[in-house]
């Protein structure tokens, strides 16, 4: 996930937000799966 050539603060911010959203989605899926399997 190189996410482009820009290293300014806005590009870094958008990349950080994307990572947080992605992790939240992944963890959310895992939690739902765990609940379903119980």
């Amino acid at each position: 996930h190189s996410d482009g050539i820009f290293t300014d603060s806005y590009s870094r911010y958008r990349k950080q937000m994307a990572v947080k959203k992605y992790l939240a989605a992944v963890l959310g899926k895992r939690y739902k799966q765990r609940v379903k399997n119980k």
């Epitope: 190189s2 996410d3 482009g4 820009f6 603060s9 806005y10 958008r14």
Partner: antibody
Framework: VEESGGRLVTPGTPLTLTCTAS????????MGWVRQAPGKGLEWIGD?????TTDYASWVNGRFTISRTSTTVTLKMTSLTTEDTATYFC????????WGPGTLVTVSS | AAVLTQTPSPVSAAVGGTVTIKCQSS????????LAWYQQKPGQPPKLLIY???TLASGVPSRFKGSGSGTQFTLTINGVQCDDAATYYC???????????FGGGTEVVVK
């Protein structure tokens, strides 16, 4: 970078636009979509990160969906009205540093 | 959504002169500098000129200069050339990307 899929559709018809690239690997870049109505200014639609997470302009209201594969980025549009008639551009990076020539979508009854 | 207000069109300039285009945002952009400028000629897609308020994009001539912070930004073209005749747009990036928006555009006419 090149867009495709634009055509004449009637109001309410869904339409999917595709963005591809030759010579560059799109998978390593965030990609954005922008539109421009005939004779009007630019309008930011939204973008998709390398992780597949998306952000949209507040006016989109869930009508448009951006997604991606390893080689393409797509813009799915629903509930189209005549107001959506425009040239649709995809562009690379959050700063929209490299643009395609655009694809024209005409919504008319 | 944010509203970006640009200098009204058209702006006229003589070859070799200076053009100043202003862009005012209804709210502060992210980190006070998340603003870009684009040049668009008829029948062509826009081209990135400046990002992060003042950083020149790759391959853009140094006669283009971006400045400003917060809500007020300026694009200056020094030593205007015939090739600079185009419409110029600003784009603001915000804490909430849902607010991201372009300005209405400013047409530059070179005499």
């Amino acid at each position: 970078v090149e867009e495709s899929g634009g055509r004449l559709v009637t109001p309410g018809t869904p339409l999917t636009l595709t963005c591809t690239a030759s010579g560059i690997d799109l998978s390593g870049y965030a990609m954005g979509w922008v539109r421009q109505a005939p004779g009007k200014g630019l309008e930011w639609i939204g973008d998709i990160s390398t992780y597949g997470t998306t952000d949209y302009a507040s006016w989109v209201n869930g009508r448009f969906t951006i997604s991606r594969t390893s080689t393409t980025v797509t813009l799915k549009m629903t509930s189209l009205t005549t107001e959506d008639t425009a040239t649709y551009f995809c562009a690379r990076d959050y700063w929209l540093s490299l643009w395609g020539p655009g694809t024209l979508v005409t919504v008319s009854s | 959504a944010a509203v970006l207000t640009q200098t009204p069109s058209p702006v006229s300039a003589a070859v070799g002169g200076t053009v100043t285009i202003k862009c005012q945002s209804s709210q502060s952009v992210y980190d006070n500098n998340a603003l870009a400028w684009y040049q668009q000629k008829p029948g062509q897609p826009p081209k990135l000129l400046i990002y992060a308020a003042s950083t020149l994009a790759s391959g853009v001539p140094s006669r283009f200069k971006g400045s400003g912070s917060g809500t007020q930004f300026t694009l200056t073209i020094n030593g205007v050339q015939c090739d600079d005749a185009a419409t110029y747009y600003c784009l603001g990036g915000y804490d909430d990307p849902a607010d991201n928006a372009f300005g209405g555009g400013t047409e530059v006419v070179v005499k």
